[in-house]
């Protein structure tokens, strides 16, 4: 017992931590003072009626990843204040409703990864009227969802069901929950997908399907009496799909009248772009989908891809597209021209070069585009990039950060409405007239700049942290500046006069520099009460670099005698 006790530490607020130890039981002597108890990653196998008896004020109990195989009936009887209970990844093979009955305040319950076959003989959750987040199921033994399983639950913020190996689904089992903001469904096979889909379509706002092999998925007409679908967003995560089954999935999505957002994360497309035109044209209507997000799409036969033109007509109403980290090196001109409503395009972490971008941003491409993100691609010339984008008349925001530009030419051409340009982490060592005068926001942080002397009359925000600047920029060149972030440079000092010359400045972040704590600098920074309002990272990030005996101390705390003043 004593070693058990020693593994637990509690602070004055009753937050007790005892995770990742060698506890084999719940420590004795726990009292009403305990508000939160984390005993995850231990070797607890048994919870008795008396273990938590005095913890009447306990609000959070985390017992994940122990070896719990037995919980006595009344173990949680005094936990009326408990809001968060995590019993995931233990060895509970039978769930008892008596455990949960007293937990009238519970908002979060995680039962994932326990080896139960079903959710018990009676309705487990019917007394949990405040429950918001529920996670149930496991990867292998949870094979059956029954109609009574979710009885009594009317509203859930999030419901996660690991039904990886589901073999039986009793119709209407999930229909009893009137509203679920986010349903996460892990299913290896798709055999029961349509049955579940029918039940959740009118109660779930955001549906997420995980780890499913849809290679052989075939859509058959739904036997749903209602087409009143609540689903606004459908996410496919780690799902396998083929050309043919993608078409079948699109037929399924057709049933969701109010679908606004479609997301594919970490999915694999085993195909070559062979989408059958005749069927597609006849059946597929993209409905109201406005946002399409694709992240880390894996296409094993990527270079065999051929004609995607059958899908072009489906894209005309889409307003936001993200295709991130999916080895995209070219967006066909024709597709770009079809994306008539597109306002936001994020192609981060792909393989775009200027010459192929030219094909993508052809005449009449993306006519409504306002924001283009090409972060971390293979762009190498600012001049070529700007010139390539001249066709995009409505473009105002461009993010080309994390491309290696190195140098910047003296002049460049850019779309005339440009307001925002992100050139952070592009290895540039100087800024020139290449930067458009129309900018309101410029981010050149994390580069090799030692000078900033550009006149940008409309600039409101300048992000220039993590460079090599030795002084603040000349305020007269930036008459409209509201925000200046210039932390982690080589600035040694700044004066009241310098700050005052930025007439419109509301926010300055200048911490992490090598401040010489001279008398002048200390008196200015310590006496100006208003300074703390402007310096958003004051005082924590303002440290003296010299004199040596105050190095590392916060500027606001340093006191120097007149005799040791370090004049700059």
């Amino acid at each position: 017992e004593s070693s058990n006790q020693a593994s637990l530490s509690c602070d004055r607020n009753g937050i007790c931590k005892g995770s990742s130890g060698s506890l084999n039981s719940i420590p004795s002597g726990l009292t009403e003072a305990v508000k939160s108890l984390d005993l995850s990653n231990n070797r607890i196998t048994y919870i008795s009626n008396s273990d938590l008896q005095r913890c009447v004020n306990l609000q959070a109990l985390v017992l994940t990843s122990n070896g719990i195989n037995t919980i006595e009936e009344d173990s949680f009887s005094s936990l009326g204040s408990l809001e968060h209970l995590d019993l995931s990844y233990n060895y509970l093979s039978n769930l008892s409703s008596s455990w949960f009955k007293p937990l009238s305040s519970l908002t979060f319950l995680n039962l994932l990864g326990n080896p139960y076959k079903t959710l018990g003989e009676t309705s487990l959750f019917s007394h949990l009227t405040k429950l918001q987040i529920l996670r149930v199921g496991n990867m292998d033994t949870f094979t059956k969802i029954q109609r009574k399983d979710f009885a009594g639950l009317t509203f859930l913020e999030e419901l996660e069901i690991d039904a990886s190996d589901l073999q039986s689904y009793e119709p209407k089992s999930l229909k009893s929950i009137q509203n679920v903001s986010h349903l996460i469904l892990h299913m290896k096979q798709h055999i029961l997908l349509l049955e579940i889909f029918v039940d959740v379509t009118s109660s779930v706002e955001c549906l997420e399907l995980r780890d499913t092999d849809l290679d052989t998925f075939h859509f058959s007409e739904l036997s749903t009496g209602e087409t009143n679908s609540l689903i606004k967003k459908f996410t496919f995560r780690n799902v396998k799909i083929t050309d043919e089954s993608l078409f079948q999935v699109m037929k399924l999505l057709n049933q969701i009248s109010g679908l606004l957002e479609l997301e594919f994360d970490d999915c694999t497309l085993n195909g070559v772009g062979n989408f059958r035109a005749s069927d597609n044209d006849r059946v597929i209507d993209p409905g109201k989908v406005e946002t399409l997000t694709i992240r880390r799409l894996h296409i094993p036969r990527f270079y065999l891809f051929y004609d995607l033109s059958t899908l072009y007509s489906l894209t005309e109403r889409v307003k936001r597209i993200t295709v991130e980290n999916s080895k995209v090196f070219l967006v066909p001109c024709l597709l770009s021209q079809h994306l008539k409503s597109l306002e936001y395009l994020d192609l981060s972490e792909n393989l775009m070069v200027e010459e192929y971008l030219k094909n993508s941003a052809c005449e009449d491409a993306w006519p409504s585009l306002q924001t283009l993100i090409l972060r971390q691609n293979h762009l190498a010339s600012l001049e070529k990039t700007g010139e390539t984008l001249l066709t995009l008349k409505n473009l105002t925001n461009i993010d080309i950060s994390k491309n290696s530009f190195h140098s910047m030419p003296e002049t460049c051409q850019w779309p005339e409405k440009m307001k925002y340009l992100n050139l952070s982490s592009t290895r540039i060592h100087s800024v020139t007239g290449c930067i458009p005068k129309t900018l309101e926001i410029l981010d050149v942080s994390n580069n090799n700049l030692n000078l900033f002397s550009l006149n940008l009359p409309q600039l409101k925000e300048l992000y220039i942290s993590r460079n090599k600047l030795m002084t603040l920029p000349d305020a007269s060149l930036l008459p409209m500046l509201l925000v200046l972030k210039i932390s982690r440079n080589a600035i040694t000092t700044f004066s009241k006069e310098q700050l005052d010359s930025f007439h419109t400045l509301k926010t300055l972040e200048a911490g992490g520099n090598n401040f010489i704590c001279s008398c002048e600098f200390l008196s200015f920074t310590q006496e100006q009460q208003a300074l703390a309002k402007v310096l958003i990272d004051w005082p924590a990030n303002y440290l003296c670099d010299s004199p040596s005996h105050v190095r590392g101390q916060q500027v606001q705390d340093v006191r120097l005698s007149v005799s040791e003043c370090h004049r700059t």
């Epitope: 070219l330 024709l334 070069v353 010459e355 192929y356 293979h378």
Partner: antibody, heavy 118, light 111 residues
Framework: QVQLQQSGPELVNPGASVKLSCKAS????????INWVKQGPGQGLEWIGW????????NFNENFKDKAALTVDTSSSTAYMELHSLTSEDSAVYFC???????????WGQGTTLTVSS | DIVLTQSPASLAVSLGQRATISCRAS??????????MQWYQQKPGQPPKLLIF???NVESGVPVRFSGSGSGTDFSLNIHPVEEDDIVMYFC?????????FGGGTKLEIK
């Protein structure tokens, strides 16, 4: 500046294996693919395959699927190619090259000469 | 596999004149309006050097006397005017389909 530095020449016995390295510098290693190309004595160029350091994904020429294994160590920005069951047919210069824009090889290593002989 | 046939295998040219090397693909290397065809130069004992990508885009730092043209299956590399430094080996390469393939090479010689 962008550089790919390959390991030195190798003389190995038939049936053995060899691991060639290619150390990258001057660019963000995980952002580009690394390709390997074979050039036999007085011969043309033969594409072996590529690896993307960001996710470790690979693609091979079928002719080399059982011959070559591609790996990366992102912490040292180094790509490796291991060649198995070597025969005299494998004697060649092996180049690593950076894949840009998904389609072209814009920077090449100096090459590693492999000689398989008993 | 896409087979790339370069012609001629060797080409004798006079310095200052134009040299044209052809590369024919066994099937189209077009990808949505872009020809995925590259040209490389290789000097003895050195790795290949990229000259042209996407059939006609000249790689940064490559002299303007090099140009590429063509689409579909027929491509050519032009060098004008030829300089002594150019009298080496040239290869075409396609990246439209896996496996990527190279042409057999064309050796430039002085006439």
């Amino acid at each position: 500046q962008v550089q790919l530095q390959q390991s030195g020449p190798e003389l190995v016995n038939p049936g053995a294996s060899v691991k060639l390295s290619c150390k990258a510098s001057g660019f963000t290693f995980t952002t580009y693919g690394i390709n390997w190309v074979k050039q036999g004595p007085g011969q043309g160029l033969e594409w072996i395959g590529w690896i993307y350091p960001r996710d470790g994904s690979t693609n091979f020429n079928e002719n080399f699927k059982d011959k070559a294994a591609l790996t990366v160590d992102t912490s040292s920005s180094t790509a490796y190619m291991e060649l198995h069951s070597l025969t005299s047919e494998d004697s060649a210069v092996y180049f690593c090259a950076r894949l840009t824009g998904g389609t072209f090889l814009d920077y090449w290593g100096q090459g590693t000469t492999l000689t398989v002989s008993s | 596999d896409i087979v790339l046939t370069q012609s001629p295998a060797s080409l004798a040219v006079s310095l200052g004149q134009r040299a044209t090397i052809s590369c024919r693909a066994s099937e189209s290397v077009e990808y949505y309006g872009t020809s995925l065809m590259q040209w490389y130069q290789q000097k003895p004992g050195q790795p290949p050097k990229l000259l042209i990508f996407g059939a006609s885009n000249v790689e940064s730092g490559v002299p303007v006397r090099f140009s590429g043209s063509g689409s579909g299956t027929d491509f050519s590399l032009n060098i004008h005017p030829v300089e002594e430094d150019d009298i080496v080996m040239y290869f075409c390469q396609q990246s439209r389909k896996l496996p990527w393939t190279f042409g057999g090479g064309t050796k430039l010689e002085i006439k």
